[in-house]
Interface confidence: low
């Protein structure tokens, strides 16, 4: 920033102005058949429905047009268990303040008017998001945008949730089968600048982004102001519960974020020094021992999100939760006078729900999560017994070609498979996406192996050997050759919001191995 020096870092905050109404966002192109069908109520599927097989022309790499049915309760439970296991979650989160089902606009408007009268200040109406989830949505969008730009086809993009915090007047009803964009008013922005520290180089930035496999936001647990001593009477206290961090996750960066409104009146030309302290030790009859973590200098007229680096203390809290006695914030004027944070425009827990203070932490796995395997084999045996007795039931997502009388199997390729979180009944805790195109590989790896089969040299040799000795050497297998990650944004049991990257969740390409 030429000629501005350090102070310029406090000048501009991103979303102070992003609170007036935005017009309806543009609609995304329609979902692929699979996603559209899944959005219409199917849990897992690839296109049409049992009565209606839609078959777009198959591309060399993927195919559509598959038969499927709704899963039974038991199967659904099994599916939920399996997916929770893949997501590394011991059980289905039941957040206190989760997301509620979106309602028809008229009913929603009527309910919102009633709720506005009943809700305590700072509590959003059901289905609306607080500051932390909204900020996390921006991160999620950033990641999704990156994924889009990295060449994922439309069918492989994650479909987002339709029910974010836009008012009903802002909504435009999409045609059936179209994905809803995340339509909400965004107030969120991290502060500009990085606390005076030299900004990370772009190489470090890229490495950091690639490394961070989980981002978690935490809500302030302090409900009532404590009586501090006269010297610290204007201090504000914040507490965040970091005890639920999955094992093996290490904090790479952590920030405390607080919103600052524009200050008018007697302080309108004032400059404030805002300091964040770690509480080291609490005492009964004297001030707590504090350790200064980060500071900001702000003008009264500034408006927007301020961020403070609390990486060091967060790591300590994760390793030794008993040391987590929270944070304290103090505000001092240019003349050295301690003032109440509200006088400096800082928004506390009694402020609007989308301006509540929160904490965000970036994590990196230090040890690989190993899925606990359950007895899949016994289940498979059970399924095959069921399949023989209930032949009318399509017990798996079956290719239309399976039903050809000629029994000719198509060549190895990617097939569409859409997993709908909505139909798993998870819309109250998974914020985004609504589901994702997992896809799968199926088909023959027969001689001669074509170029589009992405065959390895070994697979080619195996095919030749299979031709000569079919009873001893099997054909190569059709398996994923390219896998993509997905990002999932969800609430945990404590209503904290987590953004997690899951690698190898989407099949991008298949080949013979």
């Amino acid at each position: 920033m030429p000629g501005l020096g350090r102070r310029a870092q406090w000048l501009c905050w991103w979303w102070g102005l992003l609170c007036s109404c935005c017009g309806p966002p543009p609609l995304r192109p329609p979902l692929p058949a699979a996603a559209a069908a899944a959005a219409g109520g199917q849990l897992l599927g690839d296109g049409g429905s049992p009565g209606r097989t839609e078959q777009p022309p198959p591309s060399p790499q993927s195919s559509s047009g598959f038969l499927y049915r709704r899963l039974k309760t038991q199967e659904k439970r099994e599916m939920q268990k399996e997916i929770l296991s893949v997501l590394g979650l011991p059980h289905r989160p039941r957040p206190l303040h989760g997301l509620q089902q979106p309602q028809p606009p008229a009913l929603r408007q009527q309910e919102e008017q009633q709720q506005q009268q009943q809700l305590p200040r700072g509590e959003p109406p059901p289905g609306r998001l607080k500051s932390a989830p909204l900020f996390m949505l921006d991160l999620y969008n950033a990641l999704s945008a990156d994924n889009d730009e990295d060449g994922a086809s439309e069918g492989e993009r994650q479909q987002s949730w339709p029910h974010e915090a836009a008012s009903s007047s802002q909504r435009r009803q999409p045609p059936p089968g179209a994905a809803h964009p995340l339509n909400r008013k965004s107030l969120l922005a991290p502060g500009s600048g990085s606390g005076g520290a030299s900004p990370l180089t772009s190489a470090q930035d890229s490495a950091f982004l690639n490394d961070a496999d989980m981002v978690m936001s935490f809500v302030n647990l302090v409900e009532y102001d404590k009586e501090f001593s006269p010297r610290q009477r204007h201090h504000k206290e914040f507490k965040f519960n970091l005890s639920q961090i999955p094992e093996g996750e290490v904090v790479t960066a952590a920030e405390f974020r607080i919103y600052k409104d524009c200050v008018m009146g007697s302080f309108k030309n004032q400059t404030f020094l805002i300091s964040i302290y770690q509480v080291l030790q609490e005492h009964q009859h004297r001030d707590s021992d504090l350790f200064l973590l980060d500071t900001r200098v702000v003008w009264a007229s500034e408006e927007g999100w301020l961020e403070f680096d609390i990486t060091a203390t967060s790591n300590l809290w994760v390793v030794t939760p008993q040391h987590n006695m929270g944070l304290q914030l103090s505000v001092v004027t240019r003349d050295g006078v301690h003032v109440h944070p509200r006088a400096a425009g800082l928004v506390g827990r009694d402020g609007p729900y989308d301006k509540q203070p929160f904490m965000v932490a970036f994590f990196k796995v230090s040890e690989v999560h190993v899925r606990t395997t359950r007895s899949a084999s016994s289940r498979r045996r059970q399924q095959s017994r069921n399949r023989s007795t209930q032949s009318q039931d399509v017990a798996r997502v079956s290719s239309a070609s399976d039903y050809n009388s000629s029994e000719l199997k198509t060549a190895c390729r990617k097939h569409e498979l859409y997993v709908s979180f909505q139909d798993l009944g998870w819309q109250d805790w998974i914020i985004a996406p609504k589901g994702y195109a997992a896809n799968y590989c199926d088909g023959e790896c027969s001689f001669p192996l074509n170029a589009h089969m992405n065959a390895t040299n070994h697979a080619i040799v195996q095919t030749l050997v299979h031709l000569m000795n079919p009873e001893y050497v099997p054909k190569p297998c059709c398996a994923p050759t390219k896998l993509n990650a997905i990002s999932v944004l969800y609430f945990d049991d404590n209503s904290n919001v987590i953004l997690k990257k899951y690698r190898n969740m989407v099949v991008r390409a298949c080949g013979c191995h």
Partner: nanobody
């Protein structure tokens, strides 16, 4: 290192138009917001317009209805179309891109002078 390069500034008559553009030397990972700021001598830098990755836009009151912010996702470029320019719009205009993980990228600025 990533560089943001602004262009399109210059001298224009009051009531005229200009289109500023800001291109990144390479794609920045994890961008979730882009915006234009301006600064006049002796005054602090102020937000003019911003756009998020989900294409939400907003404008400072003093440019509403006259300026339009847009972005080209493919080329990682953000634009500011300025119509009905006034002498008080004279300033150095800076582009900023905010990336996930405590990083803001700023351009060097482009000067816009509106003569009466």
């Amino acid at each position: 290192e990533v560089q943001l390069v602004e262009s399109g500034g210059g001298l224009v008559q009051a009531g005229g138009s200009l289109k500023l553009s800001c291109a990144a030397s390479r794609r920045i990972s994890g961008i979730y917001a882009m915006g234009w700021y301006r600064q006049t001598p002796g005054k602090e830098r102020e937000l003019v317009a911003a756009i998020t990755t989900s294409d939400h836009t907003n404008y400072a009151d003093f440019v509403k209805g006259r300026f339009t912010i847009s972005r080209d996702k493919v080329n990682n470029t953000v634009y500011l179309e300025m119509n009905t320019l006034k002498p008080e719009d004279t300033a150095v205009y800076y582009c900023k891109q905010s990336a996930w993980g405590r990083n803001d990228y700023w351009g060097q600025g482009t000067r816009v002078t509106v003569s009466s």
